[in-house]
Interface confidence: low
């Protein structure tokens, strides 16, 4: 369901989008992800904040936790224990980095309707979770891990060496959180809660990034984060497992690192429990083209974990880095030794493989010039996954079921024809044993969430259809959207073009390129959005284009790995090539072309403006990377190698924005950054500004005091208002 674009006799009642609409979030949509608690039950927070349990099979629902109880501790989140005796309530949420936050936790006893008193949890807690069975609690407080057998029991302290910014237990440090796991936690319960595995990160030798946080004090305080930039000392990681039934008996046991990994700097990339006594760990060399998957077994006699070499599986890339953005995770089958995993096939497309003994003998499950993207669930007889196979549009996502119980396996697209015009980009959420599942469609029409039978795929009910949004959009002149491709020199460049409502091919329009372009990203997706660029097309009459060039994902390794060890070259070239093709289409005013991007997109937009082509009149970089030597080791080295003479220092030096300062002379450049950006440090923009000043090049700049990489809150309004004025001035559009 795409809101009507037809211009009829009611056209005079239709209005264009305003910037206010965007900043107020007037046209935001809702999704519905059930919080599954069994094969046929889920929890959901109602509009009035009651926590309601739904039973799909009986059709009954009842409130398990009232909004009054939630409000009594100002709870913003909750978690039901698997035995359904307790609920944790989360309040005093305090954001840290992308995923991490601290909070206060209260435990509510459902059996007596009271909060658990005595042995209350300390505060603030960095992470807390129930065991998968019963109601044991594991939590992290001041970088140490604690265990409770029952919520009212005194805690058992598992680790003692935790120290702020030095040793992290059960939670990741900055770089593991952002670039490797990427989660706020680094501890994992075994399936029945017998064991608890956790990571310890030692950051003692990591250089610290320090920046001022101004607040409103007389003296700004300094934020210090151990943050390894490219080539710097990295965290040292160790994995431990403790028996949670008798935690004091032998204490935490370290899991050995595979010898071929331990011989030089390495990363831990993920942990997957297979059974209560079998665990799978994934490791990665610092030079991220070799990954090792290691399956380890518990030795009852020695109370240790044994990882035989025969259970090590190596994944190696000869053309780029291992995996896509991350190395994929295994999904184990019921025999508890074989597994399904996505990796590149011999033709260079990411596909599902079945590994029974060795990777060399893997059986390829999917194949074609498209990519398998995620394995959602493996049951006794079915495997559910998503891919972009359907109709050969890489920016779509459909859900498929492969029957693995029969031979040959048969494949069925579950979503391809459900709501074909409205829905071409899906994700899914499965209940236990895939008895039921929810489909969440993100577009291109108005998002809709539905509930389905896991055996027949039949739709049971609509969970959320965004009716209010649909009604609100009825009198809005939304822009038109097209997704098409350009074939240039054996490269396919997919693009999305957003066109003004009364678009006329015979007229000339200003063009704005919105770019991200980072390795393994995708901007051209069949999803619904009413955002800033929708407003620019609807109200200001601009054409906006997004282009997926070399380095982007889900179209095969040739396109993806083209940027390996050479960031900042082909991504920029492909944006420029696309602009030239758009000019040839005849409706672009070639004197009014701009480019803008955020983060990696700010880097690409800066390099495009400084490309010397004369194509761009103006452009904006928000929170750009300016030199790869300033960015995080895990991310940067994955794509660039090391900044050393005997590796890739030369391209690190050649690919900076500063090296092109002179070329900004003939463009209007707006540079924007938050001063408290923990991710892409303000240093990046400070160095661009310094280089431009030294080259005596005029430019515009805006900083956002105490704002991070997201520039949220009131800064968002200021940012988009400021950028709008800049673009309108550049394109000579009246205010």
């Amino acid at each position: 369901l795409r809101p009507s674009r037809v211009h009829n006799s009611e056209e005079n009642t239709m209005r264009a989008l305003t910037l206010k609409d965007i900043l107020n979030g007037t046209f935001s949509y809702k999704t519905f992800f059930p919080n599954w608690i069994s094969g046929q039950e889920y929890l959901h927070q109602s509009a009035d904040n009651n926590i309601v349990l739904y039973n799909i099979e009986t059709g009954q629902s009842y409130t398990i936790l009232s909004n009054r109880t939630m409000k009594s501790v100002n709870a913003s989140n909750y978690g039901l224990s698997p035995d359904r005796q307790f609920v944790y309530l989360e309040s005093d949420y305090s954001k840290l980095w992308r995923y991490s936050y601290t909070a206060t936790y209260y435990i509510y006893d459902l059996s007596n309707g009271e909060f658990v008193r005595g042995n209350e949890l300390p505060r603030p807690i960095q992470y807390l979770c129930w065991s998968p069975v019963g109601s044991k609690l594991a939590y992290v407080y001041q970088n140490n891990i604690y265990l409770k057998q029952r919520p009212g029991d005194p805690p058992f302290q598992i680790t003692f060496n935790g120290r702020e910014n030095k040793i992290f237990n059960g939670i990741p440090d900055w770089v593991y959180e952002e670039e490797m796991l990427p989660t706020k936690y680094a501890l994992w319960w075994s399936p029945n809660g017998k064991f608890l595995a956790y990571a310890e990160f030692n950051d003692k030798d990591i250089p610290v990034i320090a920046y001022s946080y101004y607040g409103d004090e007389q003296y700004p305080r300094t934020i210090n984060i151990p943050y390894p930039k490219a080539g710097a000392k990295n965290p040292v990681v160790r994995i431990f497992i403790i028996d949670t039934t008798y935690p004091a008996y032998v204490g935490p046991q370290e899991v050995p690192v595979p010898a071929m990994i331990a011989s030089s700097d390495y990363y831990f990339s993920w942990l997957t429990w297979v059974t209560d006594e079998r665990v799978c760990l994934q490791w990665l060399k610092r030079v991220q083209n070799v990954s090792v998957l290691s399956i380890c077994d518990f030795r009852e006699d020695w109370q240790t974990w044994d990882c035989p070499k025969t259970q090590e599986h190596i994944e190696e890339s000869r053309t780029g880095w291992a995996g896509g953005f991350f190395v994929s995770r295994p999904v184990f089958s019921y025999d508890a030794i074989s597994y399904y995993k996505i990796f590149s096939d011999k033709d260079g497309y990411k596909h599902i493989h079945y590994i029974k003994d060795t990777v060399e003998n893997a059986i390829q499950i999917t194949s074609g010039k498209w990519e398998a993207i995620n394995i959602f669930r493996v049951t006794q007889d079915s495997l559910f996954y998503s891919s972009n196979e359907f109709e050969e549009y890489p920016g779509r996502r459909n859900i498929y079921r492969i029957s693995i119980g029969s031979y040959p396996p048969s494949k069925k697209c579950v979503t391809c024809h459900l709501r074909k015009e409205r829905c071409q980009y899906y994700t899914a959420s499965f209940s236990d044993y895939a008895k039921y599942y929810a489909l969440v469609c993100y577009g291109p029409g108005i998002p809709i969430s539905t509930l389905h039978d896991g055996r027949t795929d039949q739709e049971i009910k609509i969970l959320e259809e965004n009716k209010e949004l649909e009604n609100a959009l009825k009198n809005i002149q939304l822009p038109k959207e097209e997704i098409k491709k350009l074939e240039v020199d054996e490269i396919t460049l997919w693009y999305k073009m957003i066109l003004p409502p009364q678009f006329d091919r015979s007229k000339k329009y200003p063009l704005l390129i919105q770019v991200y372009g980072g390795p393994c990203s995708q901007s051209v997706r069949s999803v619904f959005a009413v955002n800033w660029i929708s407003y620019l097309a609807s109200k200001e009459g601009m054409v906006i284009a997004l282009v997926d060039g070399r380095g982007t994902a889900f179209q095969g390794d040739k396109l993806l790995y083209a940027v390996y060890r050479k960031l900042g070259v082909y991504e920029v070239e492909d944006q420029i090539t696309a602009v030239r093709k758009f000019i040839e289409m005849g409706f672009i005013d070639e004197k009014r072309i701009a480019i803008w991007g955020w983060s990696y997109g700010g880097y690409v937009s800066s390099l495009a403006l400084a490309s010397g082509t004369g194509l761009f009149k103006c452009g904006i970089a928000v929170a750009p990377v300016s030199s790869w030597e300033y960015y995080a080791s895990v991310y940067t080295e994955r794509f660039m190698g090391l900044p050393t003479k005997d590796d890739n220092l030369e391209h690190y030096k050649n690919s900076t924005v500063m090296a092109r300062a002179e070329y900004f002379r003939n463009v209007d450049y707006l540079l924007i950054h938050g001063t408290a950006d923990d991710n892409v440090h303000f240093q990046n923009s400070a160095q661009i500004a310094k280089a431009l000043v030294n080259a005596q090049v005029d430019f515009q700049a805006m900083w956002y005091s105490d704002q991070n990489h997201g520039l949220s809150g009131l800064s968002t309004n200021h940012l988009y208002t400021h950028m709008t004025h800049f673009l309108k001035q550049c394109f000579s559009l009246s205010d």
Epitope: V73, S94, D216
Partner: nanobody, 123 residues
């Protein structure tokens, strides 16, 4: 900006009690987390108790069960009820305020401070 003024300190015998008060200027008192720190001669300033804007309290292990922190948003005041005082509780007690979560034990995270009030516990 918020200005803080403590009162209620004094000399007391061991096992005695004192009620410390801290009055804050400004209309947005209710949005601040409030804390009581103390500093004994030659020692680091340490967080004793803190209370979030929502009323959740935190206590240092050394004072749990003896001290109680509370706030009265209508009076712009935060209180520290100190019972069963010990000689080692002798220190200058400071009131502090910050926006956001209350459970930050490092003084650097608390931008607003009072002048302090002396508490002396004699044996």
């Amino acid at each position: 900006q918020v200005q803080l003024q403590e009162s209620g300190g004094g000399l007391v015998e061991a096992e005695g009690s004192l009620r410390l008060s801290c009055i804050a200027s400004g209309r947005t008192f209710g949005t601040y987390a409030m804390g009581w720190f103390r500093q004994a001669p030659g020692k680091e300033r340490e967080l004793v108790a803190a209370i979030s804007s929502g009323g959740s309290a935190y206590y240092a292990d050394s004072v749990k069960g003896r001290f109680t922190i509370s706030r009265d948003n209508a009076r712009n005041t935060v209180y520290l009820q100190t019972n069963s005082l010990k000689p080692e509780d002798t220190a200058v007690y400071y009131c502090a305020a910050r926006r956001g979560s209350a459970y930050y034990t490092n003084r650097i995270d608390w931008p607003y401070w009072g002048q302090g009030t002396q508490v002396t516990v004699s044996s």
